[in-house]
Amino acid sequence: VVDLNLLTEEVRLYSCTPRNFSVSIREELKRTDTIFWPGCLLVKRCGGNCACCLHNCNECQCVPSKVTKKYHEVLQLRPKTGVRGLHKSLTDVALEHHEECDCVCRGSTGG
Amino acid sequence: VVDLNLLTEEVRLYSCTPRNFSVSIREELKRTDTIFWPGCLLVKRCGGNCACCLHNCNECQCVPSKVTKKYHEVLQLRPKTGVRGLHKSLTDVALEHHEECDCVCRGSTGG
């Protein structure tokens, strides 16, 4: 017997929804000579499978339809002159959080 | 005013490093019929937070990357077969100590 509640839950887990992703602050902010702690933060980003777009869609992608910026306080370490004495400061970094997601067509067939 | 040195020290304390854990010898050795004295010993085990693994990592875990066995002399008390009383002996028990730790990805996203 198939438990439909479990099946529905599984569909929800694998479908296109905002979910937790660990993102590197340095990569997000493209600040290569700065070290952040924590180096990564959990943010909500769209992910999962898209079942359907249009019948002639080649590539159906899960993309954000509602995006917000959230601020996270992190410790920032930057090199100063010499080899020791990193400049330490607390800073707020703004990271994108996806609140809602949609399945959209990224490429359609000729037919 | 935030003391950044204290904050950095806190980061160090909470980051993924070998730290002291009190472990039950009986549980470690799975010897339920034996009493050990002392019952617990301090060992180095990996613990703390992992900031980053890979950019598409859902669960970043602190795991040992260098493990050594260390021997600890303990008193072992076992029931004597067929008679009352306990059999006492000094024995060396080998416990795992974690010398180095790494943050590794335990689950990656579909993205």
């Epitope: 290569t32 000579d33 702690w37 090199p79 | 040195n5 980061v11 980053c52």
Partner: antibody, heavy 119, light 112 residues
Framework: EVQLVESGGDLVKPGGSLKLSCAAS????????MSWVRQTPDKRLEWVAT????????YYPDSVKGRFTISRDSAKSTLYLQMSSLKSEDTAIYYC????????????WGQGTTLTVSS | DVLMTQTPLSLPVSLGDQASISCRSN???????????LEWYLQKPGQSPKLLIY???NRFSGVPDRFSGSGSGTDFTLKISRVEAEDLGVYYC?????????FGGGTKLEIK
């Protein structure tokens, strides 16, 4: 396990050039500043160069400034030291070392590669 | 340049003894941020230097607690409470507070 393996050491004539490499493994290379330190035949240690985690920040002491260039390739997890106008006093074992940002110290060193400058 | 002077040059000890190595700088090595970047490294025969102590008194991960660092300003000491065979080698102090960073000349710890 953190590993740093230097290579490229050789016998070079004065005025010559050489490039040393340091292959890093066991850690996220792009998160760490890196350095080169050398040990002369009389066992003295001398700082040679430092590069920031992203490769933009560099530091050299006057003894090698203008002759040595430190660089890194994060995709290959490799640190480099390009040396030119070499002098006999550059003869040494060259070690690469990792800079730990939170501790602010050089926490791991490689085993070294030997450069000999002699005619 | 900051001159780092280590004494003694050679330190013969018996196993189990306490050993003490001094490192003096010719000027204060307090960094402009208030920290003192004084480190101690041990180089065993045929090996590369290994970090023992950073910022004067902080033991690096895995370093036994028989090693301790102390001092301030220009005067620093590394103490080994009970010397073991694996502690033998050359000890170097290092300052990173001023440019260029400089090392001491080394102290050889050997068996008496």
């Amino acid at each position: 396990e953190v590993q740093l393996v230097e290579s490229g050491g050789d016998l070079v004539k004065p005025g010559g050039s050489l490039k040393l490499s340091c292959a890093a493994s066991g850690f996220t290379f792009s998160n760490y500043g890196m350095s080169w330190v050398r040990q002369t035949p009389d066992k003295r240690l001398e700082w040679v160069a430092t590069i920031g985690s992203g490769g933009h920040y560099t530091y050299y002491p006057d003894s090698v400034k203008g002759r040595f260039t430190i660089s890194r390739d994060s995709a290959k997890s490799t640190l480099y030291l390009q040396m030119s106008s070499l002098k006999s006093e550059d003869t040494a074992i060259y070690y690469c070392a990792r800079q730990a940002p939170l501790w602010d110290c050089s926490d791991y060193w490689g085993q070294g590669t030997t450069l000999t400058v002699s005619s | 340049d900051v001159l780092m002077t280590q004494t003694p040059l050679s330190l013969p000890v018996s196993l189990g003894d306490q050993a003490s190595i001094s490192c003096r700088s010719n000027q204060s090595i307090v960094h402009s941020n208030g920290d003192t970047y004084l480190e101690w490294y041990l180089q065993k025969p045929g090996q590369s230097p290994k970090l023992l102590i950073y910022k004067v008194s902080n033991r690096f991960s895995g370093v036994p607690d028989r090693f301790s660092g102390s001092g301030s300003g220009t005067d620093f000491t590394l103490k080994i409470s009970r010397v073991e065979a694996e502690d033998l080698g050359v000890y170097y102090c290092f300052q990173g507070s001023h440019v260029p960073p400089t090392f001491g000349g080394g102290t050889k710890l050997e068996i008496k």
